[in-house]
């Protein structure tokens, strides 16, 4: 509608790291003349409408989400409404609408895309001695607390990836963050390595481990 | 269980005006918009504005810009939707929805909760 | 103009399921759209059945259920009975204004 306040807010998602403090961007334009006794503003989760910050009766109204949530004061009257959320946790990630009255009204979602990187895999094998050619072996690949879920990709020393025979399971913590267990059964060459990637999708980070069987004795690489 | 209860029906003449009020009961009125929504013989639904009664703001359909003004009275928890230089296309059945009663959120924006109508006819 | 597209009109059959949707020209319909799905009788008041979505309006049955599929808003009707025959409308927010559908006519044959 013809001068109905216009609330702007990124097209893309934040991403926040797990624990670190994130920006949902939002801002309006202010006409001449315009105070802050004028300005109404809301915080709401998008899909549940739960308010989470408020500024209205021209004063901050505070926190109403686990007291993690700010303002940016001194630049509200700038048409600044953007919020700070502190400590991001696994449970916040979701859309978040910003709500702007004034003489009209309007609002616009952003999205939180919550992040955690994965640790570098451990790497283990069983059975793990007197081994021969033509042994099968499991290969567990083990990495933790990541978010979202990984991807896990298998490959030999030749870099040609092993894709079957793999099992990966993915159990969330009480945090909301995943251990991956991924499990490559084989049969032994001569000699080998064999290598696991954990990927977080939304970080494009890679986490390696790998192993290499020579026959007798087995050894496993230094930490990079 | 919230309600909304419209006032009677009203006939006009052209180059009139006509306030049509919706009073809620059973629920939180505040911050809930009430949004108006009128229906022409034998046609669709069409927004016509809304209004957040706890910051007494309006947004108006671009069509009936400058034409219709939506009020609020809090002490009240009644609603108004006041249409002036009424036209014969002007009738139709006009209706006021709002979101059904959410405990703790924010703004409610929806229309799960209708009142029963109010017809208003415009004719010479 | 924001455009909104709606089958003009589906039939089905008692007992089976049907699924309405909701296209809108700005592109996909997403969870900020706040979905609404409003349900005409001849003679009767509108009534909402679904908002935000994905949320059942208090007294809408439960065979009766809101979705995004496919960047549309969808309603899907589970166990279709007589009594669902009517108009749906769907309706979605814009930042500052509403927009509805021009409706889906459902016969149940």
């Known amino acids: 509608p013809t001068g109905a306040v216009e609330v702007q807010v990124p097209e893309d998602p934040v991403v926040a790291l797990v624990g670190t403090d994130a920006t949902l961007r939002c801002s309006f334009s202010p006409e001449p003349g315009f105070s802050l006794a004028q300005l109404n503003l809301i915080w709401q989760l998008t899909d549940t409408k739960q308010l989470v910050h408020s500024f209205t009766e021209g004063r901050d109204q505070g926190s109403a989400y686990a007291n993690r949530t700010a303002l940016f004061p001194d630049l509200l009257a700038q048409g600044n409404a953007s919020l700070r959320l502190q400590r991001v946790r696994v449970a916040d990630e979701g859309s978040f609408t910003c709500f702007v009255s004034i003489r009209d009204f309007g609002s616009a979602a952003v999205s939180l895309q919550v992040a955690a990187p994965y640790s570098k895999p451990s790497m283990t094998l069983e059975p793990n001695k007197d081994l021969r050619p033509g042994d099968t072996v499991t290969i567990t690949c083990s990495s933790y607390r990541g978010y979202p879920e990984a991807e896990v990709f298998w490959q030999d020393g030749q870099g040609v990836p092993l894709t079957g025979n793999v099992t990966t399971s993915q159990m969330a913590n009480e945090q909301g963050l995943f251990d991956v267990h991924s499990v490559l059964r084989v049969v032994l060459g001569a000699n080998g390595t064999y290598s696991c990637l954990v990927r977080n999708p939304v970080l494009q980070q890679d986490a390696h481990g790998s192993v290499t069987i020579t026959g007798q004795p087995m050894t496993f690489p230094p930490e990079a | 269980q919230v309600q909304l209860v419209q006032s009677g029906a009203e006939v006009k003449k052209p180059g009139s005006s006509v306030k049509v009020s919706c009073k809620a009961s059973g629920g939180t009125f505040s911050n809930y918009a009430i949004n108006w929504v009128r229906q022409a013989p034998g046609q669709g639904l069409e927004w016509m504005g809304g209004?957040?009664?706890?910051?007494?703001?309006?947004n108006y359909a671009q069509k009936f810009q400058g034409r219709v003004t939506i009020t609020a009275d809090e002490s009240t928890s009644t609603a108004y939707m006041e249409l002036s230089s009424l036209r014969s296309d002007d009738t139709a059945v006009y209706y006021c929805?709002?979101?059904?009663?959410?405990?703790?959120?924010?703004?409610?924006?929806?229309?799960?909760?209708w009142g029963q109508g109010t017809t208003v006819t415009v004719s010479s | 103009d924001i455009q909104m597209t709606q089958e003009p009109s589906l039939t089905t059959s008692p007992g089976g399921t049907v699924t309405l949707t909701c296209r809108s020209s700005t592109g996909a319909v997403t969870t900020s759209n706040y979905a609404n799905w409003v349900q005409e009788k001849p003679g009767q008041a509108p009534r909402g059945l679904i908002g935000g979505t994905n949320k059942r309006a208090p007294g809408t049955p439960a065979r009766f259920s809101g979705s995004l599929i496919g960047g549309k808003a969808a309603l899907t009707i589970t166990g279709v009975q007589p009594e669902d025959e009517a108009i749906y409308f769907c309706a979605l927010w814009y930042s500052n204004l509403w927009v509805f559908g021009g409706g889906t006519k459902l016969e149940i044959k």
């Open positions: 209004i957040i009664p706890l910051f007494g703001t309006a």
């Open positions: 929805a709002r979101d059904f009663d959410a405990p703790g959120s924010g703004v409610n924006f929806g229309m799960d909760v």
